[in-house]
Interface confidence: low
């Protein structure tokens, strides 16, 4: 069993809440902060000691249709001489995001929320060495 | 999911765009994303650009808890375990979609919200600006 989450609010349904059929929820997909822009340092994917490339995945039955995934370029990390150092590891950093999936069943359509794991970039780590007895 | 009947003659009336408001199933697919168990989760400590994770909690949002990364150093950790200020630790940021309760406090009514999170840090060669 789950212990109650600290700070969890058991929502008292206000009168203004829209009626929703059982087992479903109403979702407005007009995005709040739609025009917010990422202000990351310039070209960090190329300047990183664990550089990465981006691939855009496209799915018309997903909202948003476009999801960008990063892939580490190397197994090792780039040293000060610009060479790959395989004593260190480039590893992916991942983050979950939500998408809306549209499903077709004959002449009907349904919508499902889905968690997607996005690789956002890479970082250089010291490897874990497992010693075998 | 919740099935919505399409217009008669639906093969020709396929709408390429998503409607502004949809009814979605309460069950979230991949809710417990089963990431590779062999992937170590201590990158934040082992990275040459280590970071701390700060908890951001908001009961009006799903997921209610999001972790924000903050780089520990301006520089990066070198082979001797010291901070090398010739390199920079920088945050990797990502826009993610979350659900915001709308109207507030309603249990089953949400709006998508885009938020910017720092997921981790990476070590980069600095851009050096030479002043004439």
């Amino acid at each position: 069993r789950k212990i109650p989450k600290v700070g969890h609010t058991f929502f008292q349904k206000p009168e203004s809440c829209p009626p929703v059929p059982g087992g479903s929820m109403k979702l407005d997909i007009g995005i709040i902060n739609e025009n917010q822009r990422v202000s990351m340092s310039r070209n960090i994917e190329s300047r990183s000691t664990s550089p990465w490339n981006y691939t855009v995945t496209w799915d018309p039955n997903r909202y948003p249709s476009e999801v960008v995934q990063a892939q580490c370029r190397n197994l090792g990390c780039i040293n000060a001489q610009g060479k790959e150092d395989i004593s260190m590891n480039s590893v992916p950093i991942q983050q979950e995001t939500l998408v809306v999936r549209r499903k077709h069943q004959g002449c009907s359509v349904s919508f499902q929320l889905e968690k997607v794991l996005v690789t956002v970039g890479c970082t250089c780590v010291t490897p874990v060495i497992h010693h075998v007895q | 999911g919740i099935t919505i009947p399409r217009n008669p003659g639906c093969p020709n009336s396929e709408d390429k765009n998503f409607p502004r408001t949809v009814m979605v199933n309460l069950n979230i697919h991949n809710r417990n994303t089963n990431t590779n168990p062999k992937r170590s989760s201590d990158y934040y400590n082992r990275s040459t650009s280590p970071w701390n994770l700060h908890r951001n909690e908001d009961p009006e949002r799903y997921p209610s808890v999001i972790w924000e990364a903050k780089c520990r150093h301006l520089g990066c950790i070198n082979a001797d375990g010291n901070v090398d200020y010739h390199m920079n630790s920088v945050p990797i940021q990502q826009e993610i979609l979350v659900l915001r309760r709308e109207p507030p406090h309603c249990p089953n009514s949400f709006r998508l919200e885009k938020i910017l999170v720092s997921v981790g840090c990476t070590c980069v060669t600095p851009i050096v600006h030479h002043v004439a």
Epitope: R1, K5 | N32, T33, K38, S40, S41, S64, V65
Partner: nanobody, 122 residues
Framework: EVQLVESGGGLVQAGGSLRLSCAAS??????MGWLRQAPGKEREFVAA????????YYADSVKGRFTISKDNAGITVYLQMNSLKPEDTAVYYC?????????????????WGQGTQVTVSS
Amino acid sequence: EVQLVESGGGLVQAGGSLRLSCAASGRTYDAMGWLRQAPGKEREFVAAISGSGDDTYYADSVKGRFTISKDNAGITVYLQMNSLKPEDTAVYYCATRRGLYYVWDSNDYENWGQGTQVTVSS
């Protein structure tokens, strides 16, 4: 669903030791963790071990003092607590989760035991 039963809590003096056990039955898991909740405080991650037993994770506050381990069958997970401090006083829960990414996020644990009280007196 995984059923979890904790034992081994109790009252101990500062500097003393306790060994908590958590017996699991049911489906497999990717990680089992110990989490604790002190009165009036948030639930916090203490330690976790992967299903294979290869990987262990500790909160900074217990590193070097606490050791998480499991038996060969993977049915029981232990938390050996040494050099206990009064601030370790809390209800200790064992819980399972899927995935090893961000094991310290207590919200990601799915199945919880009933908890065992650990009190450290000064």
